[in-house]
């Protein structure tokens, strides 16, 4: 004869176990069903009916099958330095990121609890590391022969061009300036020589991301600037 | 962008009923909930109840439990409050106004209210 | 139910004083369901501070919030010819969702 299909709720055999997506109540002493994801426990299970369920209420969720009395509170909408990546549902909590240009200072289980602008270097200083998601720029003073000119969170040091003749040498926050012959360049053999002084230098640029659209009815709060740090500065 | 018009002005007799609508526009009714609150003439604001457009559950204040029946109509995007046995004290401004979900019951657009007058 | 009480009802005020509203729960209402609305006559209200502090775009910055468990304000650092109109507080911790009775910031 084929097993006996158990409806919920029923007493589990000895020492075994509630299937998948029930739980054993311990004052029914029985199996019963969990709720899903964007639902909770209205009404307990007893030993002749079984779990109640009710959808959460606004700006509460659950994510997993469960038998919990409330559901969870949704996360603060986010600040003005950060995205909404994720909505607050039924179903997920509300997930927020730093938008470009912040970097995450204080993180939490899913996405950002604190962002923080990302420091920018200030003339002199080029950047060393650039910033993640999670870490700060890195500035570094400009090496001999090499310069910024910005206040840039991007920007690294660059090569001064170099003159024939110098009218005025370069320094770590400014390029050198030739007279009106023309510069030369360190050159690979064979490479063209272009009569107009022409930087060497590499625009560094970090990609950054997409900014998320939170929704339409985003409310926006305002958040100071991190203050400057070594070889950079707060503007 | 986002709006909700209100039908006009209504003028009925005491025990008549009464049927205000909202009709929404610039968003997805998805995800948001919509509020009925009324205001008599000269007196503050009262919430009367809310519903969810996409699943039709409905709240109310115990003390509207009787009096007040909402329900929408996602097909054209229009919520409705029904008053039954309409009273001299009903005579009120009556607004509609929706809330995010996830945004803990701020409601951020309202109606321009509609007022409905009870008198013989 | 929650009852929440404003004071005080009116007040009267000159353009460019500072003015606050405070909203009292009867019982512990969170931070995140706590908004402010303005209204002024003839008008639909304004959602015009959400979950305690938070202003949302279009509201002068002179206007602020804060509070938490029972006692919560409403603060105009520099009134405004705009600003004279009706307050209310509402709570949505807790249904039935209640409003306080309003404040009416007149002109003196």
């Known amino acids: 004869l084929p097993a006996q299909v158990a409806f919920t709720p029923y007493a589990p055999e000895p020492g075994g176990t509630c299937r998948l997506r029930e739980y054993y109540d311990q004052t029914a002493q029985m199996c019963c069903s969990k709720c899903p994801p964007g639902q909770h426990a209205k009404v307990f299970c007893t030993k002749t009916s079984d779990t109640v369920c009710d959808s959460c209420e606004d700006s509460t969720y659950t994510q997993l099958w469960n038998w919990v009395p409330e559901c969870l509170s949704c996360g603060s909408r986010c600040s003005s330095d950060q995205v909404e990546t994720q909505a607050c549902t039924r179903e997920q909590n509300r997930i927020c990121t730093c938008r470009p240009g912040w970097y995450c200072a204080l993180s939490k289980q899913e996405g950002c609890r604190l962002c923080a602008q990302l420091r920018k270097c200030r003339p002199g200083f080029g950047v060393a590391r650039p910033g993640t998601e999670t870490s700060d720029v890195v500035c570094k003073p400009c090496a001999p022969g090499t310069f910024s000119n910005t206040t840039s969170s991007t920007d690294i040091c660059r090569p001064h061009q170099i003159c024939h003749v110098v009218a005025i040498p370069g320094n770590a926050s400014m390029d050198a300036v030739c007279t009106s012959t023309s510069p030369t360049r360190s050159m690979a053999p064979g490479a063209v020589h272009l009569p107009q002084p022409v930087s060497t230098r590499s625009q560094h640029t970090q990609p950054t991301p997409a900014p998320s659209t939170a929704p339409g009815t985003s409310f926006l709060l305002p958040v100071g600037p991190s203050p400057p740090a070594e070889g950079s500065t707060g503007d | 962008q986002v709006q909700l018009v209100q039908s006009g002005s209504e003028l009925k007799k005491p025990g008549a009923s009464v049927k205000v609508s909202c009709k929404a526009s610039g968003f997805n009714n998805k995800d948001i909930y919509m509020h009925w609150v009324r205001q008599a003439p000269g007196q503050g604001l009262e919430w009367m109840g809310r519903?969810?457009?996409?699943?039709?559950?409905?709240k109310h204040d115990p003390k509207f439990q009787d009096k007040a029946v909402l329900s929408s109509d996602t097909s054209v995007s229009t919520a409705y409050l029904q008053i039954s046995s309409l009273k001299a004290e009903d005579t009120a401004v009556y607004y509609c106004a929706r809330s995010p979900y996830g945004d803990f019951g701020a409601m951020d657009y309202w109606g321009q209210g509609t007022l409905v007058t009870v008198s013989s | 139910d929650i009852q929440m009480t404003q004071s005080p009802s009116s007040l009267s005020a000159s353009v460019g004083d500072r003015v606050t509203i405070t909203c009292t729960a009867s019982s512990s209402v969170s931070s995140n369901y706590l908004h402010w609305y303005q209204q002024k006559p003839g008008k639909a209200p304004k959602l015009w501070i959400y979950?305690?502090?938070n202003l949302p775009s279009g509201v002068p910055s002179r206007f602020s919030g804060s509070g938490s468990g029972t006692d919560f304000t409403l603060t105009i650092s520099s009134l405004q010819p705009e600003d004279f109109a009706t307050y209310y507080c509402h709570q949505y911790h807790r249904s039935p969702w209640t409003f306080g009775q309003g404040t009416k910031v007149e002109i003196k």
């Open positions: 519903i969810d457009p996409a699943t039709g559950n409905t």
């Open positions: 979950s305690t502090s």
